[in-house]
Interface confidence: low
């Protein structure tokens, strides 16, 4: 037989605390448990779960655990069963609610000398006590015509006054705990003789030197009284007016009226209202002058036919804020069609040639009317006057192509050269009129050119091929002073293009014929081996059908190139002492020596007392300092060639001679000793 | 004060044409005002899809124009847009809105429906 | 068609704090022309400013708006919990209407 050890007992719970019931079994062969609520299985969850033959709960809830739990053993071989005893919890909670009005049904209902009552949503088990209490202070039976019982949830004021307004908050405690009110009720129950607000004045905008009204009303028994003040606190009556407000005038129904406005009656205008009792009311309202603004100018709008466009209107500053408006040949647009105003912009859908015109955009306001005009091009497709041609252009004579088009707006042309894009240079000019003008034509400047005109509406395109007429000229001219060298094979070329291919020849300028050991090789003087007599003046003539002959005179000079006879060595020199650096050259004609000290040509003439150059061209410098050191060039030159040399100059300090060495040692190094 | 309230089927399939009508209560559809149509992915931004005045002017955003027609129906004061060969992409809420008559912000608006693309 | 880019994506902030979102122009759009919304989840935008800086019809003066040009800023100067919200901005001067992609903010 199945006997119960331990069975479940009814047992106070404690609402979200712990708690068991238990449950202990004995039986011959093996059970099991299972528990009952209601009649109902008990499915475990976190909360609520099987522990060993015990029910264990972790946190009793008051309505999920609200009825009798049963501890229920079987035998599942022999289908026997045990059923405990019942239990059940005795739950003990308390949760907070609101301040509610139970009477009247609503606020709009509480006047004074009526019943209020107040509940308080504070519910528990055990039935908890209740404290009721107004802006915090707590509220005891039978004080100032109100009725409260710590057993009663319900507050009743009879009657109610000015004197109960304020904020009424609920406690509740029992054997469980305490509560307090969730949301508090606020009662508010006016006293007749503070002033109300009736009519409140409102912010107005007037023109200057119109009227600004001013309207204010407050109720209370006995009548409240009403006065107005303008910024500066100054009463305004109409007995005594500040001298800024002469024009002002207060009517028996409270209302002001300022008339013939001006900007300093601009300001916050106070309406004070008060009753026999209670707090002043202040009412502010402000009188601004009404303004507008100057409006931005608009650029000029350049559009396509067949597209949809839009141009903005910016309203100017303003109050009140100005409304906007387009006009177009002095009609007001529509709010729809193909040319219409929306907001304040202006919309041309599918543009027309027709559309183009001054559109004209309006502000306006109490201050006045404003206006601004935008003129709306609609751009055409070029079209030709005059395409351009294929030319002959003459080299280094001006040229030009033409691109004449016509299109709304002016057409703009760039031209391109070998579909590159000419920019305007000291050589390319591109006229208004699109016509290019070549400065000074050039061979290379034989190529394809390509003009293009175009607008906003499209472009077109035309082109033309330039032939050059090349002039007869030398490529290049020859040097007009050349020099040989004595003895030696030399050459002097001369060469020509034009039109046609030139003949080229060259001859003595007294007319004399050529030496036999000179030859004229196709334009080039050749001479095997130059003679002093070799020297004079050539010319050089290069002819053709068409276009005549040409002349360069060439002089020539037999020289014998430059020799150095003596170069500088690299020196080193003790500061203090003098250094010597000699240079000596030979030719014909006799060369010039010139020196290079550390990047700079030596100047002769500002040389100093320290430096000096002497005429076969050696270099001396006297009392050597190391800023001395450096590399030196000598220069070597005539008018037919130029030759350098170069050399190092040490500056040392000088060594203090030591005890071993005698009086004749030579130095470390090589010396110049002076 | 004027209230905006669309309506229309909430499931359209691919390269079919979603259709969604806005009811306007509380003012006239023939006042100074455009309504638009906007519309929102989910868990995307705002996309302005075309507005339409009471006389049956439009504009549409150019991104969708081949495919939209929003027309009006001033006897029934509700404006209608239809958005054809719809794909998953075209899967919004989409709202209806009225802009301000003297500039274009949208207040109010519709509280906007949902229209899923799918097979 | 014009660009509104939004900055930050998201921006996160305790309530109390002060928040300033950021709506760049791809090019310039007049101060007229510029409005800035609130959304909500499940909720349709509600229009917070227009005209760059004027306060719509019923919303608190914590809201503010400023800038001109490319460069527009919402302000709002002390987070309540209700103010934790994805925020658009919007360019109405040319069409197409176009919106910036979204500031969410949300509580840090």
């Known amino acids: 037989a199945i006997v119960f050890i331990k069975q479940p007992s009814s047992q106070d719970a404690l609402q979200g605390r712990r708690a068991l019931l238990r449950c202990e079994v004995e039986a011959p062969g093996p059970v099991h448990v299972y528990w009952l609520l209601d009649g109902a299985p008990v499915q475990d969850t976190e909360r609520r779960f099987a522990q060993g033959s015990s029910l264990s709960f972790a946190a009793v809830d008051r309505l999920q655990d609200s009825g009798t739990f049963q501890c229920v053993a079987r035998d599942d071989v022999t289908g026997e069963e045990a059923r405990s005893a019942n239990a059940s919890f005795n739950i003990k909670w308390i949760e907070a609610g609101p301040v509610v009005l139970k009477h009247p049904a609503s606020e709009a209902e509480i006047q004074p000398q009526t019943q209020v009552t107040l509940r308080c949503h504070i519910d528990g088990h055990p039935r908890p006590t209740y404290q009721w209490f107004r802006d915090g202070t707590p509220l005891s039976d039978g004080q100032s015509n109100h009725t409260v019982s710590s057993k009663e949830r319900n507050l009743t004021l009879r009657p109610a006054g000015p004197e109960h307004s304020g904020l009424y908050s609920c406690c509740a405690h029992s054997a469980f705990g305490q509560a307090c009110s969730s949301q508090n009720f606020t009662l508010s129950i006016a006293d007749e003789s503070f002033a109300r607000v009736v009519l409140a004045p409102q912010d107005v905008v007037v023109a200057r030197y119109e009227e600004a009204m001013f309207h204010c009303q407050f109720s209370a028994q006995p009548p409240p009284s009403l006065q107005w003040l303008f910024e500066d606190e100054t009463p305004i009556t109409n007995r005594s007016r500040p001298p800024h407000l002469r024009r002002a005038t207060v009517f028996a129904n409270g209302s002001l009226l300022l008339t013939q406005v001006r900007p300093r009656n601009a300001g916050i205008y106070r309406c004070i209202g008060q009753g026999q009792r209670g707090p002043p009311i202040i009412l502010e309202a402000t009188l601004h002058l009404a303004e507008i603004e100057d409006m931005p100018l608009f650029e000029p709008r350049v559009f396509t036919a067949g597209s949809e466009e839009r141009v903005t209107c910016l309203p100017p500053k303003g109050l009140p804020e100005p409304s906007v408006w387009w006009e177009h040949a002095g009609v007001r647009l529509p709010t729809h069609g193909r040319v219409y105003q929306k907001g304040h912009e202006l919309v041309l859908a599918n543009i027309a040639e027709s559309d183009a015109g001054v559109y004209t955009c309006h502000a306006a306001n109490l201050a006045g009317q404003r206006r601004q005009d935008v003129n709306i091009t609609v751009a055409t497709v070029p079209s030709w006057l005059k395409k351009p041609q294929d030319s002959q252009l003459e080299e280094g004579k001006p040229g030009y192509l033409d691109c004449l088009t016509q299109a709304t707006p002016k057409p703009t042309v760039v031209w391109y050269r070998n579909q590159m894009l000419i920019s305007e240079d000291s050589r390319f000019e591109v006229f208004k009129n699109g016509t290019l003008r070549i400065n000074s034509v050039e061979v290379y400047d034989g190529t394809w050119y390509r003009c293009m005109s175009s607008t906003p509406a499209g472009s077109i395109e035309a082109q033309a091929r330039v032939q050059v007429l090349e002039k007869l000229k030398f490529t290049p001219p020859p040097q007009p002073q050349q020099c040989m060298e004595f003895d030696k094979e030399a050459t002097v070329p001369c060469s020509a293009t034009g039109r046609e291919k030139p003949t080229i020849k060259w001859e003595r300028a007294d007319g004399s014929s050529l030496p036999e050991w000179v030859t004229d090789n196709a334009g080039t003087l050749h001479f095997a081996r130059v003679t002093r007599d070799d020297a004079g003046n050539y010319t050089c003539i290069a002819s053709n059908g068409p276009q005549g002959q040409i002349r360069a005179h060439v002089q020539l000079t037999v020289a014998v190139f430059i020799t150095f006879k003596v170069e500088p060595e690299r020196t080193t020199v003790y500061q203090g002492h003098t250094a010597l650096l000699q240079c000596e050259a030979q030719g014909d004609p006799k060369p010039l020596i010139q020196w290079k000290g550390k990047d700079r040509i030596l100047d002769p003439t500002k040389l100093g007392p320290r430096m000096h150059i002497f005429q076969n061209g050696s270099l001396v410098i006297h009392d050597v300092a190391p800023e001395d050191s450096g590399r030196y060039t000598c220069i070597a030159g005539n008018s037919c060639n130029i030759k350098h040399t170069e050399a190092p100059l040490y500056v040392v300090d000088k060594p203090v001679p030591e005890e071993s060495e005698g009086p004749g040692s030579p130095p470390p190094y090589k010396m110049i000793q002076t | 004060q004027v209230q905006l309230q669309e309506s229309g089927p909430g499931l359209v399939k691919p390269s079919g044409t979603l259709s969604l009508t806005c009811a306007v209560s509380?003012?006239?559809?023939?006042?100074?005002?455009?309504w638009s149509w906007v519309r929102q992915p989910p868990g995307k931004g705002l996309e302005w899809i075309g507005e339409?005045?009471?006389?049956?002017?439009?504009n549409y955003n150019p991104s969708l124009k081949s495919r939209v027609t929003i027309s009006v129906d001033k006897s029934k004061n509700q404006f209608s847009l239809k958005l054809s060969s719809v794909t998953a992409a075209d899967t919004a809420v989409y709202y209806c809105?009225?802009?301000?008559?003297?500039?274009?912000?949208?207040?109010?608006w519709g509280q906007g429906t949902l229209v899923t693309v799918s097979s | 068609e014009i660009v509104l880019t939004q900055s930050p994506a998201t921006l996160s902030l305790s309530p109390g704090e002060r928040a300033a979102l950021s709506c760049r122009a791809s090019q310039s759009v007049s101060s007229s022309y510029l409005a800035w919304y609130q959304q909500k989840p499940g909720q349709a935008p509600r229009l917070l400013i227009y005209?760059?800086?004027r306060r719509a019809t019923g919303i608190p003066d914590r809201f503010s708006g400023s800038g001109s040009g490319t460069d527009f800023t919402l302000t709002i100067s002390r987070l309540e919990p209700e103010d934790f919200a994805v925020y658009y901005c919007?360019?109405?001067?040319?069409?197409?209407?176009?919106f910036g992609q979204g500031t969410k903010v949300e509580i840090k």
């Open positions: 509380g003012g006239s559809i023939s006042s100074t005002n455009w």
């Open positions: 005209g760059a800086s």
């Open positions: 919007q360019q109405y001067g040319s069409s197409p209407r176009t």
């Open positions: 339409i005045y009471h006389s049956g002017s439009t």
């Open positions: 809105a009225r802009e301000d008559s003297n500039y274009d912000w949208f207040d109010p």
